[in-house]
Interface confidence: medium
């Protein structure tokens, strides 16, 4: 069976009342098609007795059962009843091609519209069933970062996957978080990647029948140290009403510890700059956090008095960053404005 | 730990007023907000009003003419009152309380169901 | 007022998935937006809070991100406990406003 074509029963008309059970064997990855009945008035497909959606991976649709790519668990008994009806017009079973017991490669693929046979597929080599995941070749990826690598494949019968680092097999014991193999989904995937993880991985995916192999490339980026980074628009600026509780965000990233402090900007003798040309400020709280945590200053009660403006000041080992936003304190008990969460002025 | 409980009569008369209590444990109504959220049969969710930490609340504007939201700190509970109720008032009716520091809605109470009914 | 309007309304899926939901507001709310899960016959739970803060105890295959006016919740493996309904809620202007609700169920 070639890689692109697809599983379908004929007639794809309205069939004999007297339907016979079916049996039909599909190869794992096989794309599937099962028609009853004309298309505009197909009947309803059922698994195990439970009717299928109309969308998903597994879907019965205007009298088509259609499986993108068969998976174990497809396997089972499915029926298709007619439309206001419990009348059966297809009833089979499907089975998982890593079940099969060879069959001829001159056998005739359109044999298996012969009710009366227990169907197979002719023997194939293995193909990617989903070459266009496989474009990216080469993976460039900060150290701590995450990688995985796919290489979903088919045939018949069911192929391995096994991979290979730097053309060695590579199992992973010697990596420090080792590796996850899910040979389910074709892929490899390594956790908080480091300098040695550098190289080509292959992945080897072989049955009886031949084997295909890719190659992908891993390079990892080590990180240089930064002084804090935050995020774009936190804080914001923000509207409230007197007596109600604001909530001011700071998110903070950094590779080093990093070290937070809300300020309030205050004014003193009428000046909001002291001589040395640094703004007055009030420390409301400091506190050292996780890298990628929020941050944020919980104001309960908010008077007149609280309207100014707020800093969050952010430094590590290597330097300090910091970003400033208003809050605006408006007297209505209820208000009618919309505080539409404008940029925070930046004063990094 | 943090508890939030609705209590209240069942069914209300057309016309009439809605009475409400969230009793809370774990926690004082001095240090976080809480907020009144309804819930129709098989519809989504509506928040009604929110009773800030120093007493003062605010309402959305669509409920904001029949809708009063005050508390008993003593006892630790929020109350709520809503007049003039239709039949589409019928819902179940949740309190909840702010995070803290850590955003909205973050505690639930079970919800209490009211039929606005004849 | 905003509105969060959430799609799709529901969805089917199964075991192993990976599920996106997507919630957009009608205007800028910055990242003041949660994401709560509703079973059948109970009260919301928070999932999500400041669009990409996983509530504590939740599992870590639940993902919010996004900011602005577009914002999405990630189940990053379908679990049989998952089916529900999802909402998303803005908390950055008056009326606080809830979306319709994804709702996700189990093929």
């Known amino acids: 069976l070639e890689a692109s074509e697809e599983v379908e029963l004929e007639p794809c008309l309205a069939p004999s009342l007297e339907q016979q059970e079916q049996e039909l064997t599909v190869a794992l990855g096989q794309p599937v098609r099962l028609c009853c009945g004309r298309a505009e008035r197909g009947g309803h497909w059922y698994k195990e007795g439970s009717r299928l959606a109309p969308a998903g991976r597994v879907r019965g649709w205007r009298g088509r059962l259609e499986i993108a790519s068969f998976l174990p668990e497809d396997a089972g008994r499915y029926l298709c009843l007619a439309r206001g009806s419990m009348i059966v017009l297809q009833n089979l079973t499907l089975i998982t091609g890593d079940s099969l017991t060879s069959s001829n490669d001159d056998e005739d693929p359109k044999s298996h519209r012969d009710p009366s046979n227990r169907h197979s597929y002719p023997q194939q080599a293995p193909y990617w069933t989903h070459p266009q995941r496989m474009e990216k070749k080469l993976h460039a990826v900060p150290a701590g970062n995450t990688v995985k690598f796919r290489c979903p494949a088919a045939g018949n019968p069911t192929p391995t996957i096994r991979w290979l680092k730097d053309g060695q097999a590579f199992h992973g014991e010697n990596r420090i978080g080792g590796i996850r193999l899910r040979h389910q989904h074709w892929s490899l995937v390594m956790e908080s990647v480091v300098p040695s993880d550098r190289g080509t991985y292959t992945c080897l995916v072989e049955n009886a029948v031949g084997s295909i192999r890719y190659n992908y490339l891993l390079d990892v980026l080590e990180r240089s140290p930064h002084r804090p980074i935050l995020q774009a628009g936190l804080p914001a600026n923000t509207t409230a009403v007197v007596g109600s509780d604001v909530e001011l965000l700071c998110k903070v990233y950094s590779d080093a510890q990093p070290h937070i402090q809300w300020l309030k900007h205050i004014v003193i003798n009428g000046s909001s700059f002291g001589a040395d040309g640094f703004p007055y400020v009030q420390v409301l709280k400091t506190a050292d956090i996780n890298s990628s945590e929020v941050e944020v200053l919980y104001l309960r009660n908010v008077s007149a008095e609280d309207a100014g403006e707020y800093t969050c000041l952010a430094g590590n080992s290597i330097g300090l960053s910091y970003q400033s936003a208003w809050l605006t304190v408006l007297p209505e008990e209820d208000p009618t404005w919309t505080a539409a969460a404008p940029e925070a002025r930046y004063t990094d | 730990q943090v508890q939030l409980r609705e209590s209240g009569p069942g069914l209300v008369q057309p016309s009439q007023t809605l009475s409400l209590t969230c009793t809370v444990s774990?926690?004082?109504?001095?240090?976080?907000?809480v907020s009144w959220v309804r819930q129709p049969p098989g519809k989504g969710l509506e928040w009604m009003g929110v009773?800030?930490?120093?007493?003062?609340?605010t309402y959305n504007s669509l409920l904001k003419s029949r809708l009063t939201i005050s508390r008993d700190t003593s006892k630790s509970q929020v109350f709520l009152k809503m007049n003039s109720l239709q039949t589409e008032d019928t819902a179940t009716y949740y309190c909840?309380?702010?995070?803290?520091?850590?955003?909205?809605?973050?505690?639930w109470g079970p919800g209490t169901m009211v039929t606005v009914s004849s | 007022n905003t509105v969060m309007t959430q799609s799709p309304t529901s969805m089917f899926t199964s075991v192993g998935d990976r599920v996106t939901m997507s919630c957009k507001a009608s205007?800028?709310?910055?990242?003041?937006v949660g994401w709560y899960q509703q079973k059948t016959g109970q009260s919301p739970k928070r999932l999500i809070y400041?669009?990409?803060n996983r509530d504590t105890g939740v599992p870590d295959r639940f993902t919010g991100s996004g900011s602005g006016t577009d914002f999405t919740l990630t189940i990053s493996n379908m679990q049989a406990e998952d089916p529900a309904i999802y909402y998303c809620?803005?908390?950055?202007?008056?009326?606080?406003?809830f979306g319709g609700g994804t709702k996700l169920e189990l093929k």
């Open positions: 909840a309380r702010g995070g803290g520091d850590r955003g909205y809605f973050a505690f």
């Open positions: 774990g926690f004082s109504l001095t240090f976080y907000h």
């Open positions: 009773i800030w930490t120093g007493g003062s609340t």
């Open positions: 205007q800028n709310v910055g990242i003041n």
């Open positions: 400041w669009a990409s």
């Open positions: 809620l803005q908390h950055n202007s008056y009326p606080w406003t």
